[in-house]
Amino acid sequence: QSPPGKPEIHKCRSPDKETFTCWWNPGSDGGLPTNYSLTYSKEGEKNTYECPDYKTSGPNSCFFSKQYTSIWKIYIITVNATNEMGSSTSDPLYVDVTYIVEPEPPRNLTLEVKQLKDKKTYLWVKWLPPTITDVKTGWFTMEYEIRLKSEEADEWEIHFTGHQTQFKVFDLYPGQKYLVQTRCKPDHGYWSRWGQEKSIEIPNDFTLKD
C-alpha cells in the first residue's frame, strides 16, 4: 500500500468552443481506494475552482458546460489523487478552448452519379458543415476529407478537399457499389470522427472512357 501515482491529464476536447471536456489517466492507486479531483483556475485570476461536472463525460473526466466555458481565458488545470497514504498532483495543463475543437462530422452527405459531355462518368459528393459550426462568419475555418471504397475493397481511398464542401471522383467501376464518408477539421483543431456512411452503385449503362 502506498500513496497514489501521479495522474496525467491526457486530452481535452470541445465540440463547438462552447463546452469542453478533459480526461485524465489515473496512475496507480497504491492498492487503496483513491479519490480524484480536478481543479482549475483561469489566466489572470487567483481563484481556484473544482470541476463542475464529473459525470457527463464518463469516468476520469470533467465536463465544462456553457456556463463554465470561456474562449477568452486560458484554463490552468490540475488533477489531484488522494488515498489514505497520501496524495499526488498532475502537472498543470494549460488549455485554450480555441485549440481543442473536435467537431461533429459534416452532415447531409449526398452522392450523385453524373456524366460529362464526353460520356465520362463521375461521382459527385456533396456535404454541409456540422450544424454547430458557424463557418460563414469565419468563426470556424473548416477543412474536409472524404474517403471512399468499393464494397469489395479493403482499403479506403482518401481525398483531402480543403475548404470545399463538394468533390468529384472519377474513374469508378460500373456495376460496383461504393461507400463514402466525410470528416472535418477546424483550423488548429482535431479531425472529427468519420460521418455516417452512404453508399451508391455506379450504373452499368454508363461507359467509362480511358
Epitope: H10, K17, E43, I71, W72, I74, D96, Y190
Partner: antibody
C-alpha cells in the same frame, strides 16, 4: 517529467538532406502538437512547422514548403524533421518544441546543430 | 508574414534596476476569437528558449513576478522590475495569432 531529447549534431553537404529526431517522454505523445523552430548562428528564431502526432496532420511555414517534411512515429514517441536541398543558409540549431492545448511553446528540446558546408 | 520588431537590440542593466523591452508587430495580433497571442521567451546562454509570458501579460508557471508584460494591438512591452544576474540572455517576443508564427530579432540583456 516532460522531456524532448533530440538527435546529435550533423554536418552535411549542400544539396543533401538532414533528418533530425525528437524523442518525447513523460506525457501522452499523441495528445500534443510538436513544432520545429530553427535558429541560425547569432540570429533569431524561425518557426518551420508543426505536427499533430495523433494523425500526422501537418502545417508548414510556406517558406520551407516543399523542402521540409515533419513526421511522427507513435510507436516510439518520436517526431522527425527532414530538410532537403540544403544550402549554407540552413546552418542552424534546430529545436523541437511542444505546446499545451494552446498555440505557444512550453517545452523545448535541447537543440540539434546542423552545419551545411562543402 | 507578420514582422516582429524588437527594441533595443541590447541592454546593459545594473542588478536591482528595472529593464524594459519593446516589441512591435507589423499587423494587429488580435485573433478572430478576441485573444491576443503575443508571448515572451528568454534564451539563457547555451540553453534552449523558455517561456516567460503568454498572451501579453500572463506569467508562465514558475516565472518570478518581477517579469510583467503589457500592450495591445501592435505594441507590446516586457518589463523586469529588478534585474537579477540570472536574467541575462536574449529575450524574444513571438506571435502565434497568424500563421506562420513569427519571432522578434531578440534583445540581449547583460549585467553591468
Amino acid at each position: 517529467e516532460v522531456q524532448l531529447v533530440q538527435s546529435g549534431a550533423e554536418v552535411k553537404k549542400p544539396g543533401s538532406s538532414v533528418k533530425v529526431s525528437c524523442k518525447a517522454s513523460g506525457y501522452t505523445f499523441t495528445s500534443y502538437w510538436i513544432h520545429w523552430v530553427r535558429q541560425a548562428p547569432g540570429q533569431g528564431l524561425e518557426w518551420m512547422g508543426e505536427i499533430d502526432p495523433s494523425d500526422s496532420y501537418t502545417n508548414y511555414n510556406q517558406k520551407f514548403k516543399g523542402r521540409v517534411t515533419i513526421t511522427a512515429d507513435k510507436s516510439t514517441s518520436t517526431a522527425y524533421m527532414e530538410l532537403s536541398s540544403l544550402r549554407s543558409e540552413d546552418t542552424a540549431v534546430y529545436y523541437c518544441a511542444r505546446s499545451f492545448f494552446t498555440n505557444w511553446f512550453a517545452y523545448w528540446g535541447q537543440g540539434t546543430l546542423v552545419t551545411v558546408s562543402s | 508574414d507578420v514582422v516582429m520588431t524588437q527594441t533595443p537590440l541590447s541592454l546593459s542593466v545594473t542588478p536591482g534596476q528595472p529593464a524594459s523591452i519593446s516589441c512591435r508587430s507589423s499587423q494587429s495580433l488580435v485573433h478572430s476569437n478576441g485573444n491576443t497571442y503575443l508571448h515572451w521567451y528568454l534564451q539563457k546562454p547555451g540553453q534552449s528558449p523558455q517561456l516567460l509570458i503568454y498572451k501579453v501579460s500572463n506569467r508562465f508557471s514558475g516565472v518570478p513576478d518581477r517579469f510583467s508584460g503589457s500592450g495591445s494591438g501592435t505594441d507590446f512591452t516586457l518589463k523586469i522590475s529588478r534585474v537579477e544576474a540570472e536574467d541575462v540572455g536574449v529575450y524574444f517576443c513571438s506571435q502565434s495569432t497568424h500563421v506562420p508564427f513569427t519571432f522578434g530579432g531578440g534583445t540581449k540583456v547583460e549585467i553591468k
